[in-house]
Amino acid sequence: LDPGLQPGNFSADEAGAQLFAQSYNSSAEQVLFQSVAASWAHDTNITAENARRQEEAALLSQEFAEAWGQKAKELYEPIWQNFTDPQLRRIIGAVRTLGSANLPLAKRQQYNALLSNMSRIYSTAKVCLPNKTATCWSLDPDLTNILASSRSYAMLLFAWEGWHNAAGIPLKPLYEDFTALSNEAYKQDGFTDTGAYWRSWYNSPTFEDDLEHLYQQLEPLYLNLHAFVRRALHRRYGDRYINLRGPIPAHLLGDMWAQSWENIYDMVVPFPDKPNLDVTSTMLQQGWNATHMFRVAEEFFTSLELSPMPPEFWEGSMLEKPADGREVVCHASAWDFYNRKDFRIKQCTRVTMDQLSTVHHEMGHIQYYLQYKDLPVSLRRGANPGFHEAIGDVLALSVSTPEHLHKIGLLDRVTNDTESDINYLLKMALEKIAFLPFGYLVDQWRWGVFSGRTPPSRYNFDWWYLRTKYQGICPPVTRNETHFDAGAKFHVPNVTPYIRYFVSFVLQFQFHEALCKEAGYEGPLHQCDIYRSTKAGAKLRKVLQAGSSRPWQEVLKDMVGLDALDAQPLLKYFQPVTQWLQEQNQQNGEVLGWPEYQWHPPLPDNYPEGIDL
């Protein structure tokens, strides 16, 4: 480690800790910059050389974390918890957590190599057609487009099975090793396992109980949506493939993980004679491209008097999948380079309506980075990870309203009637309500893995237990423990915690309600558009500028008047379609849930040879 990056000498009191924190901050900015830059270089061009450089940069970051973390413990353990400055307590608390820097050098190298290899396997996995040598599909855009638009049961099955096998199977042994090393590291920080560390970011002793209570409130709405969609799928695919008392085969819901169902909106639209709310075709007709999508998103932020994207953003970002054959990590992400001027998005943007939401989501991260860039490095985070995920989504709730789509020229006319309202809310439910059980279960599975409750011999069994229990879906082909289907979801091999998304999907409606009120809006929550409300922008800016400098409960209280996660704004937003769904299910005699939970569909005849291309 460069001597200039080593910790100096500081007194073992609060005044010394203040100087320690300042010195740490300037050094950490340098180390973090080189680490992020190496990761960016790798993720935008996956090569062996870039992987080696990324692992080297990770080693330097670990060396830095170890040096400063040990120094923090040596000087300020345990007195830091009694410091009068709450920000300083947060900084020292973060610096003293070493994580993977607790591992000896050889294990650090193994850990870094595992992360690099898991990322590479996921992002370079392909599905090749049977008996055809040349045709191989990547997840993005090929398989994603098939899952979204094909209505052929066999084709969907081929894409689903191919991906889960290609990505999942080779990841299993690596994930076992990663779990062991990660636990070894975080145990040395005083956590029972990695999951306990991840949960500690929410700073709530009742976190898991709170989530369970939230989910209980949201479950009836999901069950009604599930039953309604299952009936529509039954109309399309028939008794052979859909059991009206059973789980839904996982490949039929428009998304590789069945986490978001808006791609089958055309199959379930309640009132098809009303204007089409999926504006993808209009975007294509009008010649929208990736840059235009990002400019439209930026304009929403600036309409709230939030910050525009800086020049470095436009110069450095990767907004489309490269056409030069480079392998890249296509999963959309937003990057803070910790130098207070470099902020980028990496996205293989496709011109679709749901990608326009993703653009706003990612730009929400960048806006957070811009607003808290002058805080100490340790506090450049969301108030909790769910806050960070919610920001762009809150804006997207306004953008997606028919009123706003009309303003930006994507919808010819706004028909303000009950039927159009139900169409819109059902479309939003396919995106927001369908996601909730998935957002809830991913980390339940991982927490079980980290705690040892789910051993490698039960990875897949427990994954599908949760997927069936919460989502009411089943694998469309037989699975066993050679398969590792959790690994076919980006966030698992890329070690990104997931409960943040569940938290975000609840929070974003709390935010939306508060911002709509601040904007002076008084109508139904689902019709609110905060565009151009500088008062709403000012309220949001306060949250963003706080970063993680204050407890999230306080930040939330300031914004929405309540210091806890609350499902009521979400339930209020969807109330008209909740009632409508209930009535549809009542009159159709639907069974809510999946009492025949062990049912699985048969394979199509002549599969896979007979798939029609």
Epitope: Q217, E219, P220, L221, L223, N224, D417, T418, E419, I422, L571, T578, Q579, W580, Q582, E583, Q586, Q587, G589, V591, L592, G593
Partner: antibody, heavy 112, light 110 residues
């Protein structure tokens, strides 16, 4: 704003038929169902039946043979017809959208 | 036909939390029963409170919440107010028809 208003004859002789109209505003009858409920004097509520947005109906099985619920979407009206009335059919009759919005009720007295 | 049972009467004080329950003669109440709660005020006007187990109807104060507790549906009033004195009916759906409970007369001692 969702509103429902019942209008009925008030007094009906035993063995005669009843016809009550529920006029609605603030929502579409093609989208949501409308229920009929009654409350005998000093007693609880009894569900009579529902006509769904699509026009299908469900009835209380004990009263099914005497009940008929229809609607006119364009006029925003729902109709309850009930025949062979007896004294114990006396009470308040309500229409409701889902269970969130109720009319104020119309009084029915069955008496000669 | 199923019978739906509620407490005939409950008494509470302003600011207290009170829970009303709704039991089905056919077994546990589940989401398939779409439990609804309706308030009848002293003027015999009805207001829907909770729809489909736990969704608050528009305009209903946040102190009213619905849930399933054990094998029953429940309506909880957190911080009861004197204006909450009323009769509360639950209604359960049984595949093709609704059945109302007998109602709970809630007294809020002022």
């Amino acid at each position: 704003q969702v509103q429902l208003k019942e209008s009925g004859p008030g007094l009906v002789a035993p063995s005669q038929s009843l016809s009550i109209t529920c006029t609605v505003s603030g929502f579409s009858l093609t989208t949501y169902g409308v229920h009929w409920v009654r409350q005998p004097p000093g007693k609880g509520l009894e569900w009579l039946g529902v006509i769904w947005g699509g026009g299908n109906t469900n009835y209380n099985s004990a009263l099914m043979s005497r009940l008929n619920i229809t609607k006119d979407n364009s006029k925003r009206q729902v109709f309850l017809k009930m025949n062979s009335l007896q004294a114990d059919d006396t009470g308040m009759y309500y229409c409701a959208r889902g269970w969130d919005s109720w009319g104020q009720g119309t009084t029915l007295t069955v008496s000669s | 036909q199923a019978v739906v049972t509620q407490e005939s009467a409950l008494t509470t004080s302003p600011g207290e939390t009170v829970t009303l329950t709704c039991r089905s003669s056919t077994g546990a109440v589940t989401t398939n029963n779409y439990a609804n709660w309706v308030q009848e005020n002293p003027d015999h006007l009805f207001t829907g409170l909770i729809d489909g187990t736990n969704t608050r109807s528009p305009g209903v104060p946040a102190r009213f919440s619905g849930s399933l507790i054990g094998d029953k549906a429940a309506l909880t009033i957190t911080g009861a107010q004197t204006e909450d004195e009323a009769i509360y009916f639950c209604a359960l759906w049984y595949s093709n028809h609704w059945v109302f409970g007998g109602g709970t007369k809630l007294t809020v001692l002022g």
